[in-house]
């Protein structure tokens, strides 16, 4: 999960395994102020999961969410 310092959530580790796409509701990018670039996926259980934006599966999921 992202760590929130004040109102800016930042990620210090990424999930290793791809989430099932069906379990992802939405996503957002963490702030440029964070030391690690990250995509945060919000899941069907309203969990926030940090993912590496350089991973192919992450980019594919973002594209698919943008189109839906």
């Amino acid at each position: 999960s992202p760590y929130s310092s004040d109102t800016t959530p930042c990620c210090f580790a990424y999930i290793a395994r791809p989430l099932p796409r069906a379990h992802i509701k939405e996503y957002f990018y963490t702030s440029g102020k964070c030391s690690n670039p990250a995509v945060v996926f919000v899941t069907r259980k309203n969990r926030q999961v940090c993912a590496n934006p350089e991973k192919k599966w992450v980019r594919e999921y973002i594209n698919s969410l943008e189109m839906s």
Partner: antibody, heavy 117, light 111 residues
């Protein structure tokens, strides 16, 4: 591309246990979520359980809860499915699979488990 | 008994089109746009032919197409060929305790 290679066929007696292995290559096991699906002779596909990365734990189908254990050895990129208290109805081909229902879906070749006295 | 309901068998002549239905509920097909279809020849591993309701993996013929309306998904095979004779299974993510649910399978016979 992920490749999954399973262990060979097994013959077991009722009441015994069986442990089927599934070795991953192309990706590390820590980057995959392995699921297990079985198919009894002449029957359909049945999901048994698998790793849910959202919760970070293995989840099992109700039908198998208490009788199946799915484990991983990340040092050898091998997943295992152990089914205990075997009955004749457990005679089936057991498949490991990853990215079930997704575009990168990949299946092992299947392992036939025969339960016979 | 399978969670998703498919006809046990369908048949068609070469060149014809056939449709296989797969009926679920509001907690699986009706809840997600993530329905898949598998083709399985006797003694072989199931092969993914449709995912995300309508998408085809690379290498799968465009004679295979998928659709969905409410709680029912459909697989259409056009220009039937002898090699299409196989069992076809639908599957869907589930919002319940079960991660993935499958249909009971449909045997396609090419006459």
């Amino acid at each position: 591309q992920v490749q999954l290679v399973q262990s060979g066929a097994e013959v077991k007696k009722p009441g015994a246990s069986v442990k089927v292995s599934c070795r991953a290559s192309g990706y590390a096991l820590t980057e995959l979520s392995i699921h297990w699906v079985r198919q009894a002779p002449g029957k359909g596909l049945e999901w048994m359980g698998g790793f849910d990365p959202e919760d970070g734990e293995t989840i099992y189908a109700q039908n198998f809860q208490g009788r199946v254990i799915m484990t991983e050895d990340t040092s050898t990129d091998t997943a295992y499915m152990e089914l205990s208290s075997l009955k004749s109805e457990d005679t089936a081909v057991y498949y490991c699979a990853t990215d079930l229902t997704g575009s990168r879906d990949s299946w092992g070749q299947g392992t036939l488990v025969t339960v016979s006295s | 008994q399978s969670v998703l309901t498919q006809p046990a068998s369908v048949s068609g002549s070469p060149g014809q089109s056939i449709t296989i239905s797969c009926t679920g509920s509001r907690s699986d097909i009706g809840y997600y746009n993530y329905v898949s279809w598998y083709q399985q020849h006797p003694g072989k591993v199931p092969k993914l032919i449709i995912y995300d309701v309508t998408e085809r993996p690379s290498g799968v013929s465009d004679r295979f197409s998928g659709s969905k309306s409410a709680n029912t998904a459909s697989l259409t095979i056009s220009g039937l060929q002898a090699e299409d004779e196989a069992d076809y299974y639908c599957s869907s993510f589930s919002s319940g305790d079960t991660f993935v649910v499958f249909g009971g399978g449909t045997k396609l016979t090419v006459l």
